[in-house]
Every structure is written in C-alpha cells, then in structure tokens.
C-alpha cells in the first residue's frame, strides 16, 4: 500500500499532500516542494524531505572528525535538486550559480565552483557514524540493552534491517551508532542508511517526520534515554575532494 487508505494520509511523511486520486481511487501522496509521488510504506528520501522543508535554521556543526575523509553537514539546509527517483543529483547549484558536488546524503564533498563544475557521479555514502551524548542518568545504561533497543528502533521505526547497523558503541555519556551499507549489499526494497539516519536525527531533535505519531520516546529497560547532543559523520565510498585551502 502507498498510504493509509482510511483517512488518506502518509504515515511515514507528514510533509505530503494526499488525495484519493490514485488508480482505483487509491490514496496517493505527493511530497511538498517537488510534487513527486512517494511510497508511504517506507521512508521518503532525504532529498525530497529537504526540498519539502523550505526553511529552517542553519545547523553549523564543528567537532573533531573520526577520520580525515569524514564529512559533517556544515552547510545546513538548502533547496536541493532531486532526480526522478528522489535521490540527490550529484551537482547542486544555488540561485547565484554557485555549484558543488554532493554525496548520496546530500552533503557537499567538493569546494564550491561555478556552473562549469562537473560532478561525474553521485558518490555513495556507505558509512554513517551517529554520535550522541545522553543526559546524565542515575547510572550507565547496560551496553547490550542499549545495543538491542537501538537496533530494534531502527528496524521497527525506520525499517532498516539490523544487518546495516554495524555496531553500537557506548562510553557513558557517549553513544555511537555505526550504519554501514555498501552498494552491493543494498537490495531493491532496503531502506537507505542516509534516509534512516536523517529520520533518526529529526526524531532526536523533536522534529518527527512521521504523520500523527507521538515523538520518539526512547527507553532502555524503562529508563528514558534523552539525547542532548547529536553529531553525524558521513564517509563516502570515494574520499571527498577539497582543496588544501579549506583544511587550513
């Protein structure tokens, strides 16, 4: 099914317009901003979600990166160009003809240039490190309970098979969730780790993308897990290309 038939809404994406104008009067939902039809039984692509979210405060993040090739989304929000499948186009440009190349999660991976800039292919982000700091609790969470709960959450809420949750690390108060998904591993119906990470990030910030559902109530053995900081690192199958100027 593509949407909740009874009241014609999209359970997985509240930034949609739905109407019973699909084949046989079925409920069909289209993403705001792009007007593209979305499959409401799974997560909507990050590109279409960003396009739908026209304006929001910039999210500048600066923290030591876990590897020299890891990317952090320092540029914040922009209105992206999406391909017919809802994926990010490899080259993104703004209204002033400034262009740059992005990876599959829409994060810039080159210096900015002009309209002559070429981005040959959309480079896949195959490894995402979600770095969380939780609020103080009476004691540390049990690591295996935490691991189990986060895997369950990604499977049940974000529809991500646990085989793509490579590891959950914990050193109180820091939790690191490693998502990994090579091109060869990702089958047709599999949720993309970039989309799952984006939904999780929005949930953690109290900006749930789900329609009519309560916000994320994360508990480990009944104990609330409240996140006070989130940082996400993205590693691409091909390292990014930045000039030395950016690194100094």
């Amino acid at each position: 099914h593509t949407a909740a038939q009874d009241n014609c809404t999209c359970p997985t994406n509240k930034m949609t317009v739905c109407s019973p104008d699909g084949p046989g009067g079925r409920c069909q939902c289209r993403a705001l901003g792009s007007g593209m039809a979305v499959d409401c039984s799974t997560l909507t692509s990050k590109c279409l979600l960003l396009k739908a979210r026209m304006s929001a405060p910039k999210n500048a993040r600066t923290l030591v990166r876990p590897s020299e090739h890891a990317l952090v989304d320092n540029d914040g929000l922009y209105d992206p160009d999406c391909d017919p499948e809802g994926r990010f186009k490899a080259r993104q440009c703004n209204q002033t003809s400034v262009c740059w190349c992005v990876n599959s999660v829409g994060v810039r991976r080159t210096d900015k240039g002009d309209l002559s800039l070429r981005c040959d292919e959309l480079v896949r982000t195959h490894h995402i490190l979600i770095d969380l700091r939780h609020r103080p609790t009476a004691g540390a969470f049990n690591h295996s309970d935490l691991d189990a709960e986060l895997r369950r959450l990604f499977r049940e809420r974000y529809r991500l098979h646990p085989k793509f949750v490579a590891a959950v690390h914990y050193e109180q108060p820091t939790i690191q969730i490693e998502l990994r998904q090579n091109t060869s591993q990702k089958a047709a119906g599999d949720v993309d780790i970039g989309d799952a990470a984006y939904y999780f990030e929005r949930d953690i910030k109290g900006e749930s993308l789900f329609q009519g559902r309560g916000g994320l109530d994360l508990r480990v053995r009944g104990e609330p897990l409240q996140v006070e900081r989130t940082l996400i690192y993205y590693l691409d199958e091909i390292p990014p290309k930045f000039s030395m100027k950016r690194l100094t």
Partner: antibody
Framework: QVQLVQSGAEVKKPGASVKVSCKAS????????INWVRQAPGQGLEWMGV????????SYNQKFKGRVTMTTDTSTSTAYMELRSLRSDDTAVYYC????????????WGQGTMVTVSS | DIQMTQSPSSLSASVGDRVTITCRVS??????????MHWYQQKPGKAPKLLIY???NLESGVPSRFSGSGSGTDFTFTISSLQPEDIATYYC?????????FGGGTKLEIK
C-alpha cells in the same frame, strides 16, 4: 511476561480459507513485528512472512504471495494470518513469533494452531 | 534464497556426552561481524524455543551448557554435557535475508 496466544485448531476443505489469530500481551504490541512460521506434520519449519505492527504492512515469502494476507488490530494487540485457496499440503501447525530486539531472531512464539485441510 | 544444510539429521548420544550440530549456509550471513544465525530447540508438540542468537549469544534463561560458534557460512551448536531434558529437535535459522530459512533439523535421542 510476554505471551502470544493463538486461536484454536481448524479443519477446512480444499479451496477454502483459514484465518489464524495471535493475541499478544506483556509488552507494547507496536514495538515488535510479528512473523508467521508453519510446520507440516513431521517436517521442518517454514517462514511465511512478517508484519510490521507499527506500520501494518507485511513482507511475504514469495512461495505464499497471492495466497496469504497478514494483518493486525492494534486496539486488541492481535495479529492475523489468512491463507486462501487451501490445499492438502497446507495441513500444518501455524505459529506466530515475535522478533527479538536486535538481530531478527524469534524470541517468543505462540503455542501453534493446527490447520487440517481435508475433503 | 539462502539454503541451510544442517547435519546430522539425527543423532543418538548418552547423558553427559558432548553433542555437536553443524549448519552450513549457501552464502555468508555475516554483516560487519554480526552473524544473523540463530538456534532453536523444539520438543514434541511444543513451539520452538530460542536458545542462541547472533551465532554465539545465549538467550536469557537458557542453561550455559548450550553454546554456538562460527561465522560467515559455517556454524556449530554444542551441548557440553547432554541432559535427559535436552531430547528435542534443534534447528538453525538465518535472518540475514528474506525469505528467512531454517535448517532441516537435527533430532536428538538418548542412547
């Protein structure tokens, strides 16, 4: 404690349909997907599919596609499995089983429902 | 579909014996060190019971005489000291890829 309680045994004629229920208790129903597994007499275990109790949609084993429908009723914390166009080789015990936390293992099982297909 | 080859299909052992069952998978069920392989015990007329998950993790409440090992495509299930109550059929199962598949089972009997 977690419990999955299934409906009673059924006897059906070839070509008929059967609907088996699985009532969950002892946990939040929408937190864990429910799988259905069957076992023919003296045979091994065969996975039929899984339904998301959170979203309400299912993923089926290709072998049963078109004949099986899995549904849930969150108001009663119950999962259902309907099998249509029954044949004699559908005679089996049908189990519901809950996903475990982290690795798609089946940590709790219903007691099973015997379905006999005979003319 | 991933094929599961479990052996032996039946075995007879004495109380106190060490019992080993193997399961070979047609393709790897390892994802970044996590093996999506599980072992179940089924007694006659009863539902299966989870004993081992993720190849080697003992399910809560299961006696420590049960253990599992292996990775990739080759897995082993062991009962270190067979007890009379262990008489049952044991199944391996992969949950790496849909459709999830089970081994043919190993029927364990007491000599």
């Amino acid at each position: 404690q977690v419990q999955l309680v299934q409906s009673g045994a059924e006897v059906k004629k070839p070509g008929a349909s059967v609907k088996v229920s699985c009532k969950a208790s002892g946990y939040t129903f929408t937190d864990y997907s429910i799988n259905w597994v069957r076992q023919a007499p003296g045979q091994g275990l065969e996975w039929m599919g899984v339904i998301s109790t959170y979203y309400g949609d299912a993923s089926y084993n290709q072998k049963f596609k078109g004949r099986v429908t899995m549904t849930t009723d969150t108001s009663t914390s119950t999962a259902y499995m309907e099998l249509r166009s029954l044949r004699s080789d559908d005679t089996a015990v049908y189990y519901c089983a809950r996903y475990g936390d982290g690795y798609n293992q089946f940590d709790y099982w219903g007691q099973g429902t015997m379905v006999t297909v005979s003319s | 579909d991933i094929q599961m080859t479990q052996s032996p299909s039946s075995l007879s052992a004495s109380v106190g014996d060490r019992v080993t069952i193997t399961c070979r998978v047609s393709e790897s069920v390892d994802s970044y060190g996590n093996n999506f392989m599980h072992w179940y015990q089924q007694k006659p007329g009863k539902a299966p019971k989870l004993l081992i998950y993720r190849a080697s993790n003992l399910e809560s409440g299961v006696p420590s005489r049960f253990s599992g090992s292996g990775s990739g495509t080759d897995f082993t299930f062991t009962i270190s000291s067979l007890q009379p109550e262990d008489i049952a059929t044991y199944y391996c199962q992969q949950s790496y890829e849909d459709p999830y598949t089970f081994g043919g089972g190993t029927k364990l009997e007491i000599k």
